[in-house]
């Protein structure tokens, strides 16, 4: 296993609709054809997997149908979008990139993007 540098923004504010997008960029030492991207969430010292996708270079990322993540790739960049976020989902989202094929296997883990999520203010009751 060889190490690889992964860069991501330090902090992002999700939209009022609970959507957060950020780029995860990796310094590929070689010409990988198969890449796996995993998003991990760290909160209160617990790390959980949010979503993961394996893709062939030049193809779209395919997450599971029920995944809250979508993404696109361009060269050594992956543009990740996480949706359905609520205030309680605020936390550190870490991008993990694995170059699966061809060998050698490379692993890179970013420092994480702190995503802040603000629940929208409830609309005041109105009489019609």
């Amino acid at each position: 296993c060889k190490a690889m540098h992964v860069a991501q923004p330090a902090v992002v504010l999700a939209s009022s609709r609970g959507i957060a997008s950020f780029v995860c960029e990796y310094a590929s030492p070689g010409k990988a054809t198969e890449v796996r991207v995993t998003v991990l969430r760290q909160a209160d010292s617990q790390v959980t997997e949010v979503c993961a996708a394996t893709y062939m270079m030049g193809n779209e990322l395919t997450f599971l149908d029920d995944s809250i993540c979508t993404g696109t790739s361009s060269g050594n960049q992956v543009n990740l979008t996480i949706q359905g976020l609520r205030a309680m989902d605020t936390g550190l989202y870490i991008c993990k990139v694995e170059l699966m094929y061809p060998p050698p296997y490379y692993l890179g883990i970013g420092n994480g993007t702190q995503i802040y999520v603000i629940d929208p203010e409830p609309c005041p009751d109105s009489d019609f």
Epitope: P9, V11, L13, A14, F22, M88, G91, Q114, I118
Partner: antibody
Framework: QVQLVQSGAEVKKPGASVRVSCKAS????????ISWVRQAPGQGLEWMGW????????NYAQKLQGRVTMTTDTSTSTAYMELRSLRSDDTAVYYC?????????WGQGTTVTVSS | EIVLTQSPGTLSLSPGERATLSCRAS???????LAWYQQKPGQAPRLLIY???SRATGIPDRFSGSGSGTDFTLTISRLEPEDFAVYYC?????????FGQGTKLEIK
Amino acid sequence: QVQLVQSGAEVKKPGASVRVSCKASGYTFTSYGISWVRQAPGQGLEWMGWISAYNGNTNYAQKLQGRVTMTTDTSTSTAYMELRSLRSDDTAVYYCARFIYGMDVWGQGTTVTVSS
Amino acid sequence: EIVLTQSPGTLSLSPGERATLSCRASQSVFSSYLAWYQQKPGQAPRLLIYGASSRATGIPDRFSGSGSGTDFTLTISRLEPEDFAVYYCQQYGTSPYTFGQGTKLEIK
């Protein structure tokens, strides 16, 4: 070194608007947020809101909603805070600060005086 | 909104003594997203502690933070002359990101 430099003092009449700038250097501007905090003479700190320089999304204090606008110009690594319909109780020192976990780097402050 | 109440309002101590400052929240602070700042007259605030207990870069180890939920504490183990200032707590877990009213630490 990491630095935030704010624009100079302003004197405004009630009802006018003010725009304070905050120029960042020494770090990747789009990787962080910029918070705005004000402090009236002899008073404590009041959080006004923040903007994610990465995507331009904003979160404002409800009491200022509709009067405040925070923006960024990523080409010059500068954040702006505009406050409209100024009142005498808006007289304060306005600070910008880099935000991630709390506010770790602060500007020097901009004094805004609202007086007729 | 979360109201942060700091106590005492003023604390009079001598250099070398231990200072304990309290910050109480009206409801639980999400993930202990609580910061402490120091402010001296005519200066911008300075971040001391974030995440309730993590020291910011360049902050001496005589400053420590603790607590979770609704009760948080800033401790200065041995006061230096330059520590006399106003201290603010702030929660940044739930919008709006409110500040406490401050504790003034003065020389006895």
